[in-house]
C-alpha cells in the first residue's frame, strides 16, 4: 500500500456492538482482514471479518453479546486490530486504543409512526434503539420532513436539543404525501457521531374541510 | 509547544542492552501513538516501531521484533525503548515521535507530526 493512505474508524453503539471500517488504498481486493477486539478488563475477546464495501474499504461489526447487553462501560479502553494475511502468518496493519464511550454512534430511531394527523399538523413518535441507560436523558435527536418536489438535502433539519421520542410538524399544506426521518446523538464523546437516519415514515395530511357554500 | 527529548543513548557492546527515553510536554500525552525512528550513518531514517496512546498495543518493524520493546508511562509522559541483543546494525541516531493521533498504522511510520533532537546509539566491540 501507498503511504499515508489508511483509515481505521470504529464506533460503539452503546451496548453491543462495535462497527469498524477499514480502507487503504492500493490494497487488493481479495486480501483476508479482520479486526480483533481485547477489552483491557474483561475476560472475552472478540474477531470480525472485514468485508469489502467499496473498491478500497472493508467494514465489520463486532457482535459483543445480546443486542441490549451492556458489554462495555465508560471506562473500559478496547484494543482494537486490524490483521491482514500475508502469506501463512497474520500481520498488524493497524492498532488503537477504542473508548467506546468516546466514540459512539447509536442505532437508527426504530417504530416511528403517525399518532394524530390533521390538515396542517402531524404528530409523530418514535423509539430509540439498543441505547444504553447511561445516557438517562442526555441525547439530542435531528429530525427532516421530505416535502413534494423537494430531496432530503434540502429538507430543514429540526433539533430536539433533549430526550424527546415525538415531534409536532405544522405549517403543513393539507392532503399532501411527506415523509419524516429522525436520527439521534448522545451528548457524551468526544468523536461521537449520529446515528444513522431512521426508515422513513410515509404519511399523507388531511383534505382541508370543503366550505360550506361549495 | 510540543517538546520531546531522548536521552539514555550510548556506547555498547554487541549483545548488550540499552534503555532510552523520552520525555514529553505541551501536549496531552495519552492522546497520542508514539513511534521511535532511527537514522543510521549515510542512510535514511528507518521506522522501528509504535505505540497506541493508553500503552495497550505495540507494533514493531521486522528487524527489532522480539528484541526491542516500546512501553509508555503517561503518568511521567514519557516514552521508553528497551533494546535487547544489541547488533552493530542498530548503530543509528534514535528519535522519539508523536504520531497525528492516537491510531497506528504500519503503512504510515513516518506520519509524524514532531520529533525529538535524538540520541546516538553506537554497537560495536
Known amino acids: 500500500a501507498v503511504n499515508g493512505t489508511s483509515q481505521f474508524t470504529c464506533f460503539y453503539n452503546s451496548r453491543a456492538n462495535i462497527s469498524c471500517v477499514w480502507s487503504q488504498d492500493g490494497a487488493l481486493q481479495d486480501t483476508s482482514c479482520q479486526v480483533h477486539a481485547w477489552p483491557d478488563r474483561r475476560r472475552w475477546n472478540q474477531t470480525c471479518e472485514l468485508l469489502p464495501v467499496s473498491q478500497a474499504s472493508w467494514a465489520c461489526n463486532l457482535i459483543l453479546g445480546a443486542p441490549d447487553s451492556q458489554k462495555l462501560t465508560t471506562v473500559d479502553i478496547v484494543t482494537l486490530r486490524v490483521l491482514c494475511r500475508e502469506g501463512v502468518r497474520w500481520r498488524v496493519m493497524a492498532i488503537q486504543d477504542f473508548k467506546p464511550f468516546e466514540n459512539l454512534r447509536l442505532m437508527a430511531p426504530i417504530s416511528l409512526q403517525v399518532v394524530h394527523v390533521e390538515t396542517h399538523r402531524c404528530n409523530i413518535s418514535w423509539e430509540i434503539s439498543q441505547a444504553s441507560h447511561y445516557f438517562e436523558r442526555h441525547l439530542e435527536f435531528e429530525a427532516r420532513t421530505l416535502s413534494p418536489g423537494h430531496t432530503w438535502e434540502e429538507a430543514p433539519l429540526l433539533t430536539l436539543k433533549q430526550k424527546q421520542e415525538w415531534i409536532c410538524l405544522e405549517t403543513l399544506t393539507p392532503d399532501t404525501q411527506y415523509e419524516f426521518q429522525v436520527r439521534v446523538k448522545p451528548l457524551q464523546g468526544e468523536f461521537t457521531t449520529w446515528s444513522p437516519w431512521s426508515q422513513p415514515l410515509a404519511f399523507r395530511t388531511k383534505p382541508a374541510a370543503l366550505g360550506k357554500d361549495t | 509547544e510540543v517538546q520531546l527529548v531522548e536521552s539514555g543513548g550510548g556506547l555498547v557492546q554487541p549483545g548488550g542492552s540499552l534503555r532510552l527515553s523520552c520525555a514529553a510536554s505541551?501536549?496531552?500525552?495519552?492522546?497520542?501513538?508514539m513511534s521511535w525512528v532511527r537514522q543510521a550513518p549515510g542512510k535514511g531514517l528507518e521506522w522501528v516501531g509504535g505505540?497506541?496512546?493508553?500503552?495497550?498495543?505495540?507494533i514493531y518493524q521486522d528487524s527489532v521484533e522480539g528484541r526491542f520493546t516500546i512501553s509508555r508511562n503517561n503518568a511521567k509522559n514519557t516514552l521508553y525503548l528497551q533494546m535487547n541483543s544489541l547488533r552493530s546494525e542498530d548503530t543509528a541516531v534514535y528519535y522519539c515521535?508523536?504520531?497525528?493521533?492516537?491510531?497506528?498504522?504500519?503503512?504510515?511510520?513516518?506520519?509524524?507530526?514532531?520529533r525529538g533532537q535524538g540520541t546516538q546509539v553506537t554497537v560495536s566491540s
Open positions: 515521535t508523536k504520531m497525528a493521533s492516537g491510531t497506528l498504522f504500519r503503512d504510515k511510520p513516518y506520519e509524524y507530526t514532531s
Open positions: 505505540i497506541t496512546g493508553e500503552g495497550l498495543g505495540t
Open positions: 505541551g501536549f496531552t500525552f495519552r492522546n497520542y501513538a
